[in-house]
Amino acid sequence: IAAHVISEASSKTTSVLQWAEKGYYTMSNNLVTLENGKQLTVKRQGLYYIYAQVTFCSNREASSQAPFIASLCLKSPGRFERILLRAANTHSSAKPCGQQSIHLGGVFELQPGASVFVNVTDPSQVSHGTGFTSFGLLKL
Amino acid sequence: IAAHVISEASSKTTSVLQWAEKGYYTMSNNLVTLENGKQLTVKRQGLYYIYAQVTFCSNREASSQAPFIASLCLKSPGRFERILLRAANTHSSAKPCGQQSIHLGGVFELQPGASVFVNVTDPSQVSHGTGFTSFGLLKL
Amino acid sequence: IAAHVISEASSKTTSVLQWAEKGYYTMSNNLVTLENGKQLTVKRQGLYYIYAQVTFCSNREASSQAPFIASLCLKSPGRFERILLRAANTHSSAKPCGQQSIHLGGVFELQPGASVFVNVTDPSQVSHGTGFTSFGLLKL
């Protein structure tokens, strides 16, 4: 069971990143699915290595003082969502903006029907060029 | 099937990074090989988690305006290469240069004879000290 | 065999990061253990994908000129410790400090009784908020 999906620019104002099965994507079988373009949902309980990579372009003066944060989150059936992993990068002083990349990854127990998704502080700063921003998992 | 190879400084002007089976490297068996010191080639079709880490040292004034970009690329038999993953980091203002590290990783389907390699915008900026720059894969 | 442990602030002056089985941690069975809150020790020989993520907050003026470096290290029975992976990030000019995240990961052969741990140049700069700093492994 494995998946690798590709970032998609979205007009939605949500902080949850959108993904698509496009380009050189992976969706090994129907035991993992991309739901609503925003979350990877698994049908089997088990240990999964889950990862995300986010490239963004920001400028210190044009951004809030808070850093750019990417969060890998879990939503299990009947439970509140929780943060699994986070990474933070202070905005660049480069103009108009400076690109930076974040990589998150870890091993987590997922229940049947559990979903994972990626949240960022400012989705408008995310880079969607080929290969820059992606999200995936593999069952151990 | 798994491999982990170590960066090697090169006098070549190519943007493709060079690697070696040295130090604490891994080459599990002959189903994965390091070819010409530049690409990992697999003999078996399947899903692979492929990763690369690149540490580089650059300075904004001494570099081009474009960021430092590391790309993980795929070359399948009889096909042009394609970009699987990329990460970008704006150059540091630190002098003489500021170190930064990039990590790339994802799950991809590889065909028999497929090769993966790592491309960077400026190989002369890459750090080759112990553990700083490496490249590997594992078959799921 | 898999583990994922969560960073813990420590009053110790050691450069070795401290970890805990808390929050959404993983410890699949007793073939991998967290020892002294500082190292993951495996009982079985084999290939492991080992990873660490470290988020830190530093300022160029308040820090030494040397960059912040995170190292993934190996201690095998009867042998000296050795560096497996390292990542480096130059300190931010943001005030009071600028957050940055480092991700390390690679495939390595571990012997029975081998331990892996994470070393940083300045543990006082490490961020221990939910999900920011973690450490784990999985057996292939």
Partner: nanobody, 123 residues
């Protein structure tokens, strides 16, 4: 809108050198193989050289092998052709061409061409 704009042509003596450039816009340059194709006066189109998306692979017609070098700068969205040891038979209009897709290496399906730049080799 895809645009390919060649430059660098001109009059050169036999044995001389020229460097052609092709500035690309309107598409993601780094994803596509690119080629140089030429048309000598009164003749048909002749493929000269191809370069793969990252520049890893280069291919040349036998007639130019060892004399011409194709390269690209993806950060500048520019394709180049360095032409050395030029001969009278290299006289032609040189076009840069974009591949329709990044697929098989034996595919020569171009979907966009530049307007061309004239290279004249004469003493």
């Amino acid at each position: 809108e895809v645009q390919l704009l060649e430059s660098g042509g001109g009059l050169v003596q036999p044995g001389g050198s020229l460097r052609l450039s092709c500035a690309a816009s309107g598409f993601t340059f780094e994803l596509y193989p690119m080629s140089w194709v030429r048309q000598a006066p009164g003749k048909g189109l002749e493929w000269v050289s191809t370069i793969s998306p990252t520049g890893l692979l280069t291919y040349y017609a036998d007639s130019v092998k060892g004399r011409f070098t194709i390269s690209r700068d993806n950060s500048k969205n520019t394709l180049y052709l360095q032409m050395n040891s030029l001969r009278a038979e290299d006289t032609a209009v040189y076009y840069c061409a974009k591949f329709k897709r990044s697929g098989k290496t034996d595919d020569t399906n171009f979907d966009y061409w530049g307007q061309g730049t004239l290279v004249t080799v004469s003493s």
